[in-house]
Interface confidence: medium
């Protein structure tokens, strides 16, 4: 049997079908069906329209594209590739569009894409090459500066026994394409751990949001290379204690602020170094709000109010907290 044809005038890691775009370039003021357009604001909104595909006839002037609240299911390679290319597209919001699959090269041929929001999509399959577009060991840098991936974890029964963290990290580190990324949001993804090699591939990060995950420990994560990091959000996780290695790394980052509220801190003898560090540091703006969750006798005590004599290790922890 024979393959489909793949005529192309783009250089790309994947064939690009001429017929996948509008046969004629759209008129400058044309607005796709089911969308609202403002040429003055360079904005196209195709919101809550149950679209199953990206409109082919997007106006060339589009700088801000909202495709939220749709039913896209799959983003194939070259989903936004057009003739002429959408050269101005800088902000793309695909949140809440029931995407469960983003394929290699989905965002190719968007030379100005700075901000991408894929939040609130159950991404069961995020290709390792979704953002890099190629499987080269070092690929061309992506123009992306902000990547918003909040609540992209699929329901538990749809996770196919694969490491969701691993899948996301593979896409983020592929070919070092995201080395220009300054903002990364990964909130509400049920992350149990922070993979060791995630942060090493993102040297330009200024803002990292990991709030509302299930992080129990940061022992294996290294923040050393994040010399530009300004905000690290770790609120609403399952952190029990922070160890000296992590605290020392944060201390070495010139501008960082770390947010730690609403974690179930275990106030035993292992907490002594962290408490001492908190009392001295300016790195944690919400430090006065941090309270003990365990053991029972320490519950709701402020971490800044503790003395070393308060921190002993003879209390028995709940079983659920002994696993890390």
């Amino acid at each position: 049997s024979s393959p489909t044809s793949s005529a192309s005038s783009f250089s790309s890691s994947a064939p690009f079908l001429a017929s996948a775009v509008s046969a004629q370039p759209p008129l400058p003021d044309q607005c796709p069906a089911l969308c609202e357009c403002s040429e003055a604001a360079r904005t196209v909104k195709c919101v809550n329209r149950n679209l199953t595909e990206v409109p082919t006839d997007l106006p060339a002037y589009v700088r801000n594209l909202f495709l939220t609240g749709n039913q896209l299911a799959v983003l194939p390679a070259g989903a936004f590739a057009r003739r002429p290319p959408l050269a101005e597209l800088a902000a793309l919001n695909l949140s809440g569009s029931r995407l469960d699959e983003v394929r290699a090269g989905a965002f190719e041929h968007l030379p100005s894409l700075r901000q991408l929001d894929l939040s609130h999509n159950p991404l069961a399959d995020l290709s390792p090459f979704a953002f890099s577009g190629s499987n080269a060991s070092v690929s061309a840098p992506s123009p992306l500066v902000e990547l918003i991936l909040n609540h992209i974890v699929p329901p538990e029964d749809e996770r196919q026994n694969r490491s969701f963290e691993g899948m996301v990290v593979a896409a983020l580190r592929s070919g070092l394409a995201l080395r220009g990324l300054t903002r990364l949001e990964l909130a509400s993804n049920h992350f149990l751990f922070l993979p060791r090699d995630l942060l090493a591939q993102l040297p330009s990060l200024r803002y990292l949001d990991l709030r509302n995950n299930s992080l129990v420990s940061l022992t294996y994560a290294s923040f050393r290379n994040l010399t530009h990091l300004e905000s690290l959000h770790l609120e609403d996780n399952a952190l029990k204690v922070l160890h000296n290695s992590t605290l020392a790394e944060w201390h070495g980052l010139a501008h960082v602020k770390v947010f730690l509220d609403n974690n179930p801190w275990v106030c035993d003898c292992y907490m002594a170094d962290m408490v001492a560090w908190l009392k001295e540091t300016e790195v944690v703006p919400d430090k006065a709000r941090l309270t003990c969750a365990f053991p029972e006798k320490m519950r709701n005590r402020g971490l800044l109010d503790l003395n070393s004599s308060d921190l002993d290790c003879d209390a028995v922890l709940p079983q659920s907290l002994q696993t890390s």
Partner: antibody, heavy 122, light 110 residues
Framework: EVMLVESGGGLVKPGGSLKLSCAAS????????MSWVRQTPEKRLEWVAY????????YYLDSVKGRFTISRDNAKNTLYLQMSSLRSEDTALFYC???????????????WGQGTTLTVSS | EIVLTQSPALMAASPGEKVTITCSVS???????LHWYQQKSGASPKPWIY???NLASGVPVRFSGSGSGTSFSLTISSMEAEDAATYYC???????????FGAGTKLELK
Amino acid sequence: EVMLVESGGGLVKPGGSLKLSCAASGFTFSDYAMSWVRQTPEKRLEWVAYISSGGGNTYYLDSVKGRFTISRDNAKNTLYLQMSSLRSEDTALFYCAREESYNYYRHFFDYWGQGTTLTVSS
Amino acid sequence: EIVLTQSPALMAASPGEKVTITCSVSSSISSSSLHWYQQKSGASPKPWIYGTSNLASGVPVRFSGSGSGTSFSLTISSMEAEDAATYYCQQWSSYPPILTFGAGTKLELK
């Protein structure tokens, strides 16, 4: 040259189980979504199951949900279909099919295997 | 669930004759989701037309596809002996995720 070669078909009693395999060659298997499609004795084509390139996403025909499981081993370039609680109406020629990955016309099958026959009969 | 109805189920055409096979969809779908395959006796299906109107590689230009919404068709401008085969239309719908085929149209040479 792209090749898809199915195997594992045979005669099974109702309620029995069987695992089909599809060996892929001539292309980067891990780049492509794959499906199983069956052809009934009446020559009707019926899509059975789909799996995305990385294996994270699967879809099934309603009548096989809970009985069939599609999976893949990208290291071995092989697609599988584990079938259990088989019924006489599952009797068919089973094809594995590759989905064209690099265009917007999704779920279009650009290569098909030669098929393997499943017969469910007592 | 979307149902594809092909008509006619069986037809015969003479060499040189124009042939049209239709595929009616029970509810409106995107044109990019409608595809056609050709199958000859004893062989596997072959990709024929994708996204309503795009010919797969190697398909003769006498074939064309058209349609939108709920009505799609495959046309042969001038029937040739090698075109005798069964043609199936196929569509994909995102929610619920399901892929369906028409029952097929068997085209014979008169």
